[in-house]
Interface confidence: medium
């Protein structure tokens, strides 16, 4: 199809379902994170061909946004990523699932951003914490896949300088909870978790106190299962490749994939002068696919030895999973030796490239 | 190729019926919702009537409610238009057009034309 | 009348730029995704604008749309003698359970 393919993925139902048709679910991720939204169809029946839409318009297939019947995922999130989001009836345009989607810095995957919030002094004699940045803090619920990394952050102030302890679920919450550990920055006022699993949703409170007070704060965290989608492919790979008569080539494929990826390597041929068959597939022959002894890295790599001008053409990436496909394409131009240039233009002949 | 081929138009006096069919190929026609639209001479365009894909479910303007019934042959990739109860103001050119939920291919339209 | 709102008519000469509107309401535009189609004459529709403001393949980029609202816009820039033709926008009508068509625009060059 000329636009709009739907990407089917399908798999568990998302960790965050969709709310009933007419409600809107109020939805916060990370600067980074990947927004998985998942709309299940209403009474468990058939869906139904559907599409998404954010800010009143449709959504197209890209390597960053996935789209499939009753789950969307946008990739690295960023501001832009913010909006009104809905699953709706291809036909009817009638909206199955709403969602109100932002996407925030803080709390953030990683430490980009270490340092900005150390304790300072504010030119107060003496007071009780309070908080430095607020508007930082105003993202209450955190919904992140699982293997991200969360930190939460606190950042506050008083005199003397606060001390700062995280509860999680009401309970003192200490490194030894949790599989992996947890890191304290006390100088950041943050607690950081990596590789994040279901148990570790729950709410998350900091207590910062001093002599003449305390304030808290509680963040909610929700992990969602990684969902299954089809192979994703490196943007800009494999390559166009130029080669002289004889020499060596490689073209490259990367391949992310939770599910076990099929690699194949296809190289476009014709068959009675023409590209494709009768319905529209394209004629090709399979020249790398796995075997008994090869690793995706090598099945990663295509490389053509000593090229003929047969093997210029249209080389295709196929990566495979259980739940569905994807192909980049690349073509292979091959040119004259450079001796055969150089009696060629001696004489007088002219070769375009 | 995407390929939507009209056919079943003609002259029928007012009152009278006619059954219109459209040919599709190149894409998998059961995965589609399909409409028909019609456009009268020298006049803008006027959707007529939708088909879903997943259930059947059926859409008409207000103009041909009761009158005109749309069914498809996903066996067949067919689309129909059964017109009854017919009338002048339903002489047109009449497309069938494949929904995403846009138009993103049309047939190339067959003639209706209602007189005594 | 149609639900949707065009001019009848806009002009413009070679290289110019001109812009098509198109007027609904919450139950239409406000609610749904908007496209455009451009019809020769003596041929069937075109889709030229999908999603709003997405374009199929084979469609020039000199063709954009866009939507604020209630209203969506179909800009055509460097203006060519073959860009004659009539331009309709459609969407699909909540309150109406059906799709609608503005009355088209004829685009001529002058």
């Known amino acids: 199809e000329s636009l709009g393919t739907e990407q089917r993925v399908v798999g568990r139902a998302a960790e965050v379902p969709g709310p009933e048709p007419g409600q809107q679910e109020q939805l916060v991720f990370g600067s980074g994170d990947a927004v998985e939204l998942s709309c299940p169809p209403p009474g468990g029946g058939p869906m139904g061909p559907t599409v998404w839409v954010k800010d009143g318009t449709g959504l197209v297939p890209s390597e960053r946004v996935l789209v499939g019947p009753q789950r969307l995922q946008v990739l690295n999130a960023s501001h832009e990523d913010s909006g009104a989001y809905s699953c709706r009836q291809r036909l009817t345009q009638r909206v199955l699932c709403h969602f109100s989607v932002r996407v925030t810095d803080a709390p953030s995957s990683g430490d980009d951003e270490d340092g900005e919030d150390e304790a300072e002094d504010t030119g107060v004699d003496t007071g009780a914490p309070y908080w430095t940045r607020p508007e930082r803090m105003d993202k209450k619920l955190l919904a992140v896949p699982a293997a991200n990394t969360v930190r939460f952050r606190c950042p506050a102030a008083g005199n003397p300088t606060p001390s700062i302890s995280w509860l999680k679920n009401g309970r003192e919450f200490r490194g030894e909870h949790r599989i992996g550990g947890i890191k304290l920055r006390h100088q950041q006022w943050s607690l950081v978790m990596e590789s994040v699993v279901p148990s570790d949703r729950g709410n998350y409170t900091c207590v910062v106190e001093n002599k003449f007070g305390s304030i808290r704060q509680t963040y909610t965290l929700d992990v969602l299962e990684r969902s299954p989608h089809r192979p994703i492919l490196q943007a800009g790979l494999p390559a166009n490749q130029t080669a002289v008569l004889g020499s060596d080539v490689e073209f490259h494929c990367k391949v992310y994939s939770d599910a076990q990826p099929h690699i194949q390597w296809l190289k476009h041929v014709e068959v009675n002068g023409s590209k494709v068959g009768p319905d529209g597939t394209p004629y090709v022959t399979v020249l790398k696919t796995a075997g008994a002894n090869t690793t995706d890295k090598e099945l990663e790599v295509l490389s053509l030895h000593n090229v003929t001008f047969e093997d210029a053409g249209e080389y295709t990436c196929l990566a495979g999973n259980s739940i569905g496909f994807s192909h980049h394409s690349a073509w292979l131009v091959v040119l004259p030796a450079e001796e055969e240039l150089v009696e060629a233009d001696e004489a007088g002949s002219v070769y375009a490239g | 190729e995407v390929q939507l081929l009209e056919s079943g138009g003609g002259l029928v006096q007012p009152g009278g019926s006619l059954r219109l069919s459209c040919a599709a190929s190149?894409?998998?026609?059961?995965?589609?919702?399909m409409s028909w639209v019609r456009q009268a001479p020298g006049k803008g365009l006027e959707w007529v009537s939708a088909?879903?894909?997943?259930?059947?479910?059926?859409y008409y303007a207000d103009s041909v409610k009761g009158r005109f019934t749309i069914s498809r042959d996903n066996s067949k990739n067919t689309l129909y238009l059964q017109m009854n109860s017919l009338r002048a103001e339903d002489t047109a050119v009449y497309y069938c057009?494949?929904?995403?939920?846009?138009?993103?291919?049309w047939g190339q339209g067959t003639l209706v034309t209602v007189s005594s | 009348q149609s639900v949707l709102t065009q001019l009848p008519s806009a002009s413009g000469t070679p290289g110019q730029r001109v812009t098509i509107s198109c007027t609904g309401s919450?139950?239409?535009?406000?609610?749904?995704?908007v496209s455009w189609y451009q019809q020769l004459p003596g041929t069937a529709p075109k889709l030229l604008i999908y999603?709003?403001?997405h374009r199929p393949s084979g469609v020039p980029d000199r063709f954009s749309g866009s939507k604020s609202g209630t209203s969506a816009s179909l800009a055509i820039s460097g203006l060519r003698s073959e860009d004659e033709a009539d331009y309709y926008c459609?969407?699909?009508?909540?309150?109406?359970?059906?799709?609608?068509f503005g009355g088209g625009t004829k685009l001529t060059v002058l």
């Open positions: 919450s139950s239409n535009i406000g609610n749904n995704t």
């Open positions: 088909i879903s894909s997943s259930d059947g479910s059926t």
């Open positions: 190149g894409f998998t026609f059961s995965d589609y919702d």
């Open positions: 057009a494949k929904h995403l939920p846009n138009f993103d291919y």
């Open positions: 999603y709003d403001s």
């Open positions: 459609g969407t699909w009508d909540d309150s109406l359970n059906g799709y609608v």
